[in-house]
């Protein structure tokens, strides 16, 4: 008999013969039996986890921490299905590693192709930092901007914690280093983050004591937003902040995106013991 | 390289069948949806619908449902588009996208 | 269905100029616009998606601005290979791609 579900993969899901499930009760459909969100069918004698997620046609590029880019994150999670292994969003936008759009025939520097710089220093700059040659040293700089991704606390490779998957990517330029996301909410051992300081240095900061602190401490320097901007948080609540000329939303649990549009499946990526979550 | 290629121009007769290919390269198939989209002579885009690669659902804007079928290949990464019953009206190029990409696009002829 | 108006239909400018062309939406969009070029003949290039992101190899001459129902496409300094038609299209909320009618850059 089979020992897992992984040795009953089939092109569309996974398919479990020839067994007695009297005798047998690892194959039987209950919490636990498909991970990732397959959906488990018994027919008669057979347990098949389907993958049949019903993705729609948004394009919301998003990269995941497998390195392939997905159109939005639905694609990502029938993928983590199908392969049956965990694929964490680690950016919004499609995977730094694609050169410019089209055919090679319109405006874009890189025409659809890869340009190769000509070799130089430059060359050791990696993981999304650009290089500045007009530096009398070798200077690789981040221009990555966090301030406005939301707070989606994960554990990274180096063991820290970060408040987002924007934090883990700006951290990896900074130190030249590859720094993926190993699992969300706060690593458990750790708790500690990197953040950019107004001049661009990187300052430790503790998250131990408390996080809602931070929370409390920012929400202190928003007001609610003018009328007329009614409408413009979809799933949350609209602030203005002295120093923002646009409003921003804070989202309600399980939304996220500028206007709080976008269904957040992230919350639900790693889940706790046995428990099997169904996305709705 | 991200890659959309697509099968050669096309002359028919009207009340023929065509079938056009737009064979993907350079990322993963499934990850992204197809659509097509079709360009009358002089004129801007219409949007045709589109088939989620991983299922092969199709979906049809409504101007585009009865003659047209969107189908795949998912072995050798190829979305294919066929008409049926063509007409005079079906002349134009049409092209594969997957949003950031599009094919070279396919110029069909219809005439009599 | 979500209507999508660009202006202006044509523009005439020489090279080194700035222009900006607009598009407007029937309904709030939020940040979900694109702009793609298109030269005579051949495919189009996606520019700038979520209104303002810049596609990967697109020069930063180019920039996307607007969110909800008003949005534009400003080129600066014009280059020769700039020249041709533009269109925005709506990529979110709905099953449907809606483009806008096109803008003809043409030289001045």
């Known amino acids: 008999f089979p020992t897992s579900l992984s040795d009953c993969q089939t092109p569309t899901g996974w398919n479990c013969s020839g067994y007695d499930d009297r005798e047998n009760d690892l194959f039987l459909c209950d919490t636990n039996t498909c991970k990732f969100d397959g959906e488990c069918l018994r027919i008669g004698d057979t347990v098949t986890c389907v993958c049949q997620f019903k993705c729609n046609n948004d394009y919301v590029p998003v990269c995941g921490s497998n390195g392939e880019s997905y159109q939005n994150e639905c694609y990502l999670r029938q993928a983590a299905c199908k392969q049956q292994s965990e694929i964490l969003v680690v950016s919004e936008g499609s995977c730094a590693t694609d050169a410019g759009s089209g055919s090679g025939d319109g405006v874009h520097e890189g025409s659809g192709e890869t340009s190769q710089k000509e070799t130089s220093t430059c060359d050791i700059c990696q993981f999304g930092a650009e290089c500045d040659e007009d530096a009398e040293d070798v200077w690789c700089v981040c221009n990555i901007d966090c301030s406005q991704t939301n707070f989606n606390p994960l554990c990274a490779s180096d063991g820290k914690s970060y408040d987002n998957a924007c934090q883990i990517k700006e951290a990896s330029c900074q130190k030249q280093e590859k720094i993926e996301v190993m699992s969300l909410g706060r690593c458990q051992d750790n708790t500690t983050t990197t953040t950019k300081s107004e001049d661009g240095h990187y300052a430790r900061t503790d998250y131990a004591e408390n996080a809602n602190k931070l929370e409390e401490s920012a929400r202190e320097h928003h007001i609610p937003c003018p009328e007329h901007y009614n409408g413009f948080c979809m799933h949350g609540k609209c602030e203005h902040s002295i120093n923002m000329q646009e409003p921003s939303c804070r989202c309600d649990a399980g939304y996220t995106g500028q206007h709080c549009e976008k269904k957040d499946y992230s919350v639900l990526y790693v889940v706790p013991g046995p428990v099997r979550f169904q996305y709705v | 390289q991200i890659h959309l290629v697509q099968s050669g121009p096309e002359l028919k007769k009207p009340g023929e069948t065509v079938k056009i290919s737009c064979k993907a390269s350079g990322y993963t198939f499934t990850n992204f949806a197809m659509n097509w989209v079709k360009q009358a002579p002089g004129k801007g885009f219409k949007w045709m619908g589109w088939?989620?690669?991983?299922?092969?659902?199709?979906t049809y804007a409504d101007d585009f449902k009865g003659r047209f079928a969107f189908s795949l290949e998912t072995s050798v990464s190829i979305a294919y588009l066929q008409i049926n019953s063509l007409k005079n009206e079906d002349t134009a190029t049409y092209f594969c996208s997957k949003f950031d990409y599009w094919g070279q696009g396919t110029t069909l002829t219809v005439s009599s | 269905d979500i209507q999508m108006t660009q202006s202006p239909a044509s523009l005439y400018a020489s090279v080194g100029e700035t222009v900006t062309i607009t598009c407007r939406a029937s309904?709030?969009?939020?940040?979900?616009l694109a702009w793609f070029q298109q030269k005579q003949g051949k495919s189009p290039h996606l520019l700038v998606y979520n209104a303002k992101t810049l596609a990967a190899g697109v020069p930063s001459r180019f920039s996307g601005s607007g969110s909800g129902t008003q949005f534009s496409l400003k080129i600066t300094s014009l280059q020769p290979e700039d020249f041709g038609s533009y269109y925005c299209q709506h990529h979110y909320g709905t099953p449907t791609w809606t483009f806008g009618g096109g803008t003809k850059l043409e030289i001045k």
């Open positions: 309904e709030n969009i939020y940040s979900y």
């Open positions: 088939i989620n690669t991983y299922t092969g659902e199709p």
